[in-house]
């Protein structure tokens, strides 16, 4: 019996038509919703004039709906047994989900001033800068709607930059209309313990933003795992929206709609100093910010985003060091909100539920050429947003994954 | 590749003038604001004069201010500065560096520098 289940298992996720796998992976069958919490400042000026501590004050969620749409360019190569797609992004804004609406304003850094300060370094060019922010009435922070925030908006300052400087900034612009990949998977058809691993990513098998291993793509997007996983595996997986692969481990049983699933979690060892995990080394990438690599519980993708500061973290700080959130007033890490965590079904190695979490900061230095960033005594990571994405699996999906899946096994 | 040859350094007596000359290649060069930096030992490189790009934004730092004049020439590829009423402060290797922008990358390139001796 026990190899029967086994056979029809191992034929039914592979991603190849006619699958339930692959009918599920090219359009997902959950819904799955972002939502977003700002971080509001409440003192701006005390922290431009007195470089005092940033006060934030979370307002959320702001909920939009994502990954409905279809995987694209779908082409299946027989000769390596991958499948190769394309993620297209797109957000439909969910009111009724929403504690306001996308023209609600907030208190925010100012995006452009704290990303040009930091890239533009050359001494003439930092002096042009301060006349066109100062032109521009421009500040160390800004008024934004959550529209222009999220997706984008024309920077007054940006756009009187006599160069060609990108004008249109926003956290995740451009975003709609967009695609994430070219991602190359195994469908497991020759070997079903490779079923959605990741061959290559945008046509490499490293990302040129980390040293050593660190660069590595490795495992499956999340969605989804090889079969027949055991609590004691640790999972890996690579998430573009942090620039780098990251792991799960076993954390307890847990009963989703009456499917016996693993509650795999990302640990705090993940988010360690290479002084507690020796590992993270290369992801350690300057020695000021991070204190000769000592600070932990933030990831510079800076590389990643074309030279911009953006640090990513789990939000309000959580597993990060002191040092980090010491500058910031009105954050409360905990981990039953803030972490990320993993639903697997253990046969069939599908995610049925998942809530991915993280928190988009922006690194601001002092400057002494540029005024409105002339009077701070530190360096700041200042947290934007956070956001908390999760899927479940649907009550329909649900009962035929009881009947056709763990029904037949036990 | 790119390349900025500075010239025209050389010993003068407090008073009297140079003009140096920074002749550039392996870029388009109206595209990049032309500046000029000086540097003593020990001590950090200074700003002296730039030129954003022809009838562009024009800067000079307060001690040279009225003395220092910089002109470039986008058909030659060269940019220039006249140096009157030498003092003996001004010594130092003067530097010549180009700039420009593009999307969310800095191209930042400088020459290897010519000494500027004023002395009697």
């Known amino acids: 019996g026990d190899l029967l289940i086994q056979k029809t298992i191992k034929k039914q996720v592979v991603l190849e038509e006619g699958t339930i796998a692959f009918k599920n992976w090219v359009k997902t069958g959950t819904e799955v919703y972002r939502q977003f919490w700002i971080f509001d400042v409440q003192n701006p000026q005390e922290v431009m004039m007195n470089s005092s501590n940033i006060q934030v004050k979370q307002r959320g969620p702001y909920t939009y709906r994502v990954r409905f749409l279809a995987k694209e360019n779908v082409t299946q190569d027989a000769e390596d047994n991958t499948v190769s797609f394309l993620q297209p992004n797109g957000a439909i804004f969910e009111p009724s989900l929403s504690v306001g609406t996308e023209a609600d304003n907030f208190t925010v850094l100012n995006l452009a001033v704290a990303a040009a300060s930091h890239i533009y370094q050359n001494q003439f060019v930092q002096m042009i800068l301060n006349s066109l922010i100062n032109k521009s009435k421009s500040s160390m922070f800004q008024v934004r709607t959550l529209r222009e925030l999220l997706w984008g908006y024309r920077d007054p300052f940006l756009s009187l930059v006599p160069y060609p400087v990108t004008t249109t900034v926003g956290l995740f612009y451009p975003y709609n209309n967009t695609a994430d990949g070219v991602y190359k998977v195994f469908n497991g058809k020759d070997n079903i313990s490779k079923v959605a691993i990741i061959d290559t990513y945008k046509g490499k098998r490293n990302l040129s933003y980390w040293e050593s291993h660190c660069d590595m793509i490795n495992g499956t997007d999340a969605a989804s795992f090889p079969p027949f996983v055991e609590k004691s595996q640790v999972l890996q997986f690579f998430s573009s929206d942090i620039c780098r692969s990251i792991y799960a481990v076993f954390e307890s049983d847990v009963n989703l709609k009456g499917i016996p699933v693993y509650r795999f979690v990302l640990p705090s060892k993940a988010f360690a100093s290479p002084v507690e995990n020796p590992d993270n080394y290369c992801f350690c990438t300057e020695k000021i910010i991070s204190k000769n690599c000592t600070s932990y519980g933030v990831l510079d993708i800076s590389k990643c985003k074309e030279g911009r500061p953006v640090y990513i973290s789990l939000p309000h700080f959580l597993y990060a060091s002191p040092d980090v959130s010491e500058p910031i007033d009105g954050l409360n890490p905990n981990e039953e909100e803030h972490r990320t965590y993993l639903d697997i079904e253990p046969i069939t190695g599908f995610t049925l539920q998942f809530a991915k979490r993280l928190q988009v900061n922006l690194l601001v230095k002092p400057s002494e050429k540029i005024q409105v960033l002339k009077n701070l005594k530190r360096n700041y990571i200042v947290p934007i947003l956070w956001l908390n994405e999760t899927g479940t699996i649907g009550d329909e999906k649900a009962n035929m994954f009881r009947s056709q899946v763990t029904g037949k096994i036990n | 590749q790119v390349q900025l040859q500075e010239s025209g350094g050389g010993l003068v007596q407090p008073g009297g003038s140079l003009r140096l000359s920074c002749a550039a290649s392996g870029f388009t060069f109206s595209n990049y604001a032309m500046s000029w930096y000086r540097q003593t030992p020990g001590k950090e490189r200074e700003l002296v004069a730039a030129m954003q790009s022809t009838g562009g934004t024009t800067y000079y730092a307060d001690s040279v201010k009225g003395r220092f004049t910089i002109s470039r020439d986008d058909a030659k590829n060269t940019v220039y500065l006249q140096m009157n009423s030498l003092k003996p402060e001004d010594t130092a290797v003067y530097y010549c560096?180009?700039?420009?922008?593009?999307?969310?990358?800095?191209?930042?390139?400088w020459g290897q520098g010519t000494q500027v001796t004023v002395s009697s």
């Open positions: 560096n180009a700039v420009t922008l593009q999307g969310w990358s800095e191209y930042d390139y």
